[in-house]
């Protein structure tokens, strides 16, 4: 589209500078040497080339590096990154966190594009694991990044990286993802004292097993209802009324408002009505007095 035979007299670019923004697309194509462009990539981002002009500059780099750009060029792409396709990015080998940061900065404030997703994928695969510095960087730019990973991908996150995770980074995680992250968080925060530990582990509790919830109930943690509602139903069901009361502390009154929703609804069905009545909240639906509760799952396990 922008191919032209010759550069007009006197327009040959000797360096990449501001004068080039006044060139038409075909003039850029004809008058800018690809090797000059590659060696002076650091200047490109300082010059406000338009989106169309960037097309031409990309075309020149593509011709110079058909197998993929070297990192020395990639780290200075700046706004030119917006022109890259996932196919282009799959040819790259990005190893420097500074390069990653520079490219994410260009996309700042936008949703994660397919280009950015591909870039991150290439970077993380190149590193072999999602280390703390990388996770720090990615969640700073994309708070929902962790929850976009599969449980398999999350399994490569080392416990030390969990320190970089903020509560909002887990907002969109599903139970399968929290199942993977919770044990890592437990390991990462194991040396903290009770109240500090709870503050850190709270966002991960959607992956906690029953025995850990029982342990927390002994520590006066006063879990809020929002956290309780995100707990695994199978982890909540075995808790006694007394344990839930201790776990929630003053927030126990909130159970009434949630009695029709999981996991509260399912938990109520498993409790003796007598025990529920001790809470004084008017929770209904427990096992009537005098009924015998058989734990069939235990019977199956024994046979």
């Amino acid at each position: 589209e922008v191919e032209k035979t010759a550069c007009p007299s006197g327009k040959k670019a000797r360096e990449i500078d501001e004068s080039l923004i006044f060139y038409k697309k075909w003039e850029l194509e004809a008058c800018v040497d690809a090797a000059l462009l590659a060696t002076q990539m650091d200047r490109v981002n300082a010059i406000p080339f338009t989106y169309e002009q960037l097309d031409v500059l990309k075309h020149k780099l593509d011709e110079l590096y058909p197998q993929g750009y070297p990192e020395s060029v990639i780290q200075h792409l700046g706004y030119l990154f917006l022109k890259m396709s996932p196919e282009d990015i799959r040819k790259w080998n990005v190893t420097s966190l500074e390069t990653l940061k520079a490219l994410l900065e260009v996309n700042k404030g936008h949703e994660m594009s397919p280009q950015v997703a591909t870039l991150i994928d290439r970077f993380v695969k190149g590193r072999g694991q999602l280390d703390k510095d990388t996770l720090d960087t990615l969640t700073a730019f994309y708070p929902g990044y962790l929850c976009s990973l599969s449980p398999e991908e999350l399994s490569s996150v080392p416990p030390s990286s969990i320190w970089a995770v903020r509560p909002q980074d887990l907002d969109t995680c599903d139970p399968r993802q929290l199942d993977v992250l919770y044990p890592k968080a437990r390991l990462a925060f194991q040396n903290m004292n009770g109240s500090e530990y709870f503050v850190k582990i709270q966002s991960f509790l959607g992956g906690a097993p029953t025995e850990d919830l029982k342990a927390l109930s002994q520590q006066n943690v006063s879990m809020d209802l929002a956290t309780f509602m995100k707990l695994r139903t199978d982890a909540v069901l075995p808790l006694t009324v007394a344990e839930v009361q201790k776990l929630l502390g003053p927030h126990v009154e909130g159970l009434k408002a949630e009695e029709r929703h999981r996991p509260v609804r399912d938990w109520i069905l498993r409790q003796r009505q007598d025990d529920l009545d001790t809470l004084g909240l008017g929770l209904q639906g427990g096992i009537p007095n005098g009924y015998l509760v058989l734990d069939l799952s235990m019977q199956e396990a024994l046979s």
Epitope: I21, K25, L28
Partner: antibody, heavy 118, light 107 residues
Framework: EVQLQQSGAELVKPGASVKLSCTAS????????MHWVKQRTEQGLEWIGR????????KYAPKFQGKATITADTSSNTAYLQLSSLTSEDTAVYYC???????????WGQGTSVTVSS | DIVMTQSQKFMSTSVGDRVSITCKAS??????VGWYQQKPGQSPKALIY???NRHTGVPDRFTGSGSGTDFTLTISNVQSEDLADYFC?????????FGGGTKLVIK
């Protein structure tokens, strides 16, 4: 002095077509992009599209694709805007403007008023 | 399309005052913004290109600033001949788009 001289006012019937011209003096249109802009009474400016007279390459705003056709004749140093299937919505003043590679519009014609009425 | 918003439709000022007209882009347009003046019954005239550069012949009381998404045209020592509509234009990506305009009214 750089000047863009546009053709005179047009009164046309609905469904018809019209072709407006814009002739440059004191510069060669091949060295610039030539843009066309629409302005309806008491309303803002809308970019219709542009042409590179050097090679005839055009770019249009999606809204005007199919409605507008921009051409250029370098021998007469003139750019043209053709509007087809005219309706009352096309009643407006149309400006041509010249600009460099940045896409900015540096010099403007005096405008051509197009009135679509039966 | 990139939307250019000029939130003030009218601005009232007095001769000798300083006035700032703003324009906000819906996404980053770097410095690819121009400012245009249109006096009643006339065609637009380019004042500022690439956000902060004055066109030839434009008085130095007109100053442009900004980059990214926020842009300002400042007229210091306003003169009666500055009564006009002022439009911003983004030419970072096509379709190029104009702001809705700000009419400067002299008290």
């Amino acid at each position: 002095e750089v000047q863009l001289q546009q053709s005179g006012a047009e009164l046309v019937k609905p469904g018809a077509s019209v072709k407006l011209s814009c002739t440059a003096s004191a510069f060669n249109i091949k060295d610039y992009y030539m843009h066309w802009v629409k302005q309806r009474t008491e309303q803002g400016l809308e970019w219709i599209g542009r042409i590179d007279p050097e090679d005839g390459e055009t770019k249009y705003a999606p809204k005007f694709q199919g409605k507008a056709t921009i051409t250029a004749d370098t021998s007469s140093n003139t750019a043209y805007l053709q509007l087809s299937s005219l309706t009352s919505e096309d009643t407006a003043v149309y400006y041509c403007a010249s600009g460099s590679g940045t896409g900015a519009m540096d010099y403007w014609g005096q405008g051509t008023s197009v009135t679509v009425s039966s | 399309d990139i939307v250019m918003t000029q939130s003030q439709k009218f601005m009232s000022t007095s001769v000798g005052d300083r006035v700032s007209i703003t324009c906000k882009a819906s996404q980053n347009v770097r410095t690819a913004v121009g400012w245009y003046q249109q006096k009643p019954g006339q065609s637009p005239k380019a004042l500022i290109y690439l956000a902060s550069n004055r066109h030839t012949g434009v008085p130095d009381r007109f100053t442009g600033s900004g980059s990214g998404t926020d842009f300002t045209l400042t007229i210091s020592n306003v003169q009666s001949e500055d009564l006009a509509d002022y439009f911003c234009l983004q030419h970072w990506n096509s379709p190029y788009t104009f702001g809705g305009g700000t009419k400067l009214v002299i008290k």
